[in-house]
């Protein structure tokens, strides 16, 4: 069963946000961070095939403005009651009687149920409040240190303008039950009879505290001589405006190629991916396009020598088993893309980083770009998926899941529509069912899975994670150079 929290958020957002302006919170841990007036950065996506993520920077608008004063009040919207129930049951039985009166009978039942009842309300900042706020206060001088860092990285910064929150504590439970029974009798000189039955019940409960943010809306900050807030989204808008004069930032030797407003590794990556192809829609938004994008990245990895591949794989396996190391590696690569030499790291993150830098501590773009792409894919996946990838890497069993995920992405086109696909037994190996690695990998992407007759129900919102899972499997498998 995938994340119960994510399922609830998805349902609430589907119900209450018809304009598609709310951004769903992806984990319960981060749900308290998104509050009105909080600043967030949009982590650029390493691919066309999965969405950028928003990350709190532990700053509020008041921290970057002066004179110092509390944030103005927010407007509380009316409360919505939300009730969602799901109940599914499949039963089957079979009886076989042979002419000589031998009998075999069996039955099985699988049921899945969940129900959620909650009150959700919105908190928002009134447009007039923004006007008053910006009229009365201005950008703090000297600029806040965190803002300076974001500027140097060329990150875009947003402010949370509205949130959907839970009114009371909510308990969400999903139950999955399986029952089976069998009987046989073989009459003859000695009558042989047997009977057996069993059941398995799995329950997943998550408690969502009162005041948890389920989804939020943002507006982009624009910072030049002062702070301003963008009213209409614009995908090309930069938060930090380049200086009005023709002044260019200087970069140390061997740094990333000169790029406008910050030396963004993501832009390096996008330039690399779109080299020689039109920037808009460089790859078609289907499985062929995804495969082409992944192959473009893989080509760089094919040039690495075996020894370096091995070191990189060992480091990556360690990083997959350690979420903090994964985050540290991501941060270090971000720092390296904009601030020159990279600070060395300990542990598995350090082992990966060592493979990507020169003795001067500068990143080697040809090596770093594929790793940044891979990390971008990995950060879309859950901790459970990371652990399973590490195990598959260790046991060199990446190709099976890779073929399965690829096949599903190909069959499920167009990705924007729900569909049901049966799974060819050849792709499942000998294990399919709850707890099997392939099952868990797909379940964590948000797909509904069927066990008795192996099938998958495609959900449009699973696209990002499925594409990221495919890219992760493909690149890790390419690095380990498993025979294709």
């Amino acid at each position: 069963m995938g994340s119960a929290f994510e399922r609830v958020v998805r349902r609430v957002v589907q119900e209450l946000d018809h304009g598609g302006e709310f951004i769903p919170v992806t984990s319960l841990q981060s749900s308290t961070g998104f509050q009105p007036y909080c600043l967030v950065v949009r982590k650029p996506s390493s691919s066309w095939f999965w969405k950028p993520r928003y990350k709190c920077v532990n700053l509020s608008i008041k921290d970057i403005l002066e004179p110092d004063a509390a944030e103005p009040d927010v407007q509380r919207g009316r409360s919505f009651h939300f009730y969602d129930a799901m109940d599914g049951q499949i039963q089957g039985s079979v009886e076989l009687a042979a002419p000589g009166q031998a009998k075999i009978a069996g039955g099985a039942a699988v049921s899945d149920s969940s129900s959620t009842s909650m009150n959700v309300y919105s908190l928002s900042v009134d447009p007039n409040t923004w006007q008053t706020l910006l009229h009365e206060r201005h950008l703090r001088q000297p600029e806040h240190k965190v803002l300076q860092q974001l500027r140097s990285r060329g990150d875009n910064v947003y402010v949370v303008t509205e949130v959907l929150q839970t009114q009371k504590e909510v308990e969400v439970t999903r139950t999955h039950k399986r029952e089976g029974s069998g009987r046989f009798s073989l009459p003859g000189a000695t009558c042989l009879q047997g009977e057996g039955q069993g059941h398995l019940s799995q329950k997943k409960t998550v408690t969502i505290p009162s005041g948890s943010t389920l989804a939020f809306r943002v507006a982009q900050l624009v910072i030049d001589s002062d702070l301003d807030v963008l009213l209409f989204p614009d995908k090309k808008q930069r938060t930090f405006q380049p200086p009005a004069t023709g002044h260019k930032r200087s970069t140390s030797e061997g740094a990333w190629p000169q790029l406008p407003s910050g030396l963004s590794m993501m832009r390096c990556l996008h330039n690399f991916l779109t080299d020689g192809v039109p920037a808009e829609g460089a790859f078609t938004e289907d499985f062929q396009g995804l495969r082409a994008e992944v192959e473009t990245i893989s080509k760089e990895l094919e040039l690495l020598d075996r020894e370096l591949c091995q070191l990189l794989l060992e480091g990556l396996e360690g990083v997959l088993r350690d979420q903090l190391a994964l985050r540290a590696l991501e941060e270090a690569l971000e720092q390296g893309q904009s601030l020159g030499p990279v600070e060395p790291l300990d542990g598995p993150a350090g082992a990966v980083l060592e493979c990507l830098v020169l003795s001067s501590g500068m990143l080697v773009p040809e090596l770093a770009i594929p790793v940044v792409y891979l990390l971008g894919a990995l950060t879309m996946l859950s901790e459970t998926q990371h652990k399973l990838l590490a195990e598959a890497l260790e046991s060199q069993t990446l190709l099976g899941p890779l073929e399965l995920v690829g096949s599903l992405l190909e069959q499920s086109a167009p990705w924007q529509e729900r569909s049901t696909m049966s799974l060819p037994p050849g792709l499942l190996g000998n294990s399919w069912g709850e707890g099997a690695p392939a099952w868990v990998l797909l379940d964590e992407c948000g797909l509904e899975l069927g066990e008795d007759t192996p099938h998958v129900c495609w959900e449009p919102q699973a696209q990002g994670r499925m594409c990221a899972l495919y890219a992760s499997l493909a690149l890790l498998s390419g690095l380990s150079q498993e025979p294709h």
């Epitope: 002062d226 614009d234 995908k235």
Partner: nanobody
Framework: QVQLVESGGALVQPGGSLRLSCSAS????????MSWYRQAPGKERELVAT????????NYADSVKGRFTISRDNAKNTVYLQMNSLKPEDTAVYYC??????????????WGQGTQVTVSS
Amino acid sequence: QVQLVESGGALVQPGGSLRLSCSASGFTFSKYLMSWYRQAPGKERELVATITTAGGNTNYADSVKGRFTISRDNAKNTVYLQMNSLKPEDTAVYYCKASGGTIRTVNETYWGQGTQVTVSS
């Protein structure tokens, strides 16, 4: 002071092309949504196309979709309207409009004087 100056209007044959320009001064151009409107004789002024502050998003009237393209150059404080496959019904005075696209500029709107486009054989 604030100025919007349109240029590029002309007499053109049906099926022909024109490129209108609107040069802005006296305000922070990059904080404004820019739009092109047109007004044919005896008709109301209608919105033709709009572009957001950094040029990332555009919007068009159904009657010009696929034929007209709006673009902007914030370094030159200029917005453009590329008009292809022109039809007689595109004949009008074309106006440029700047509307505040941020909280600080939200209440500000500026108009140009207009440039005449005539499509006729």
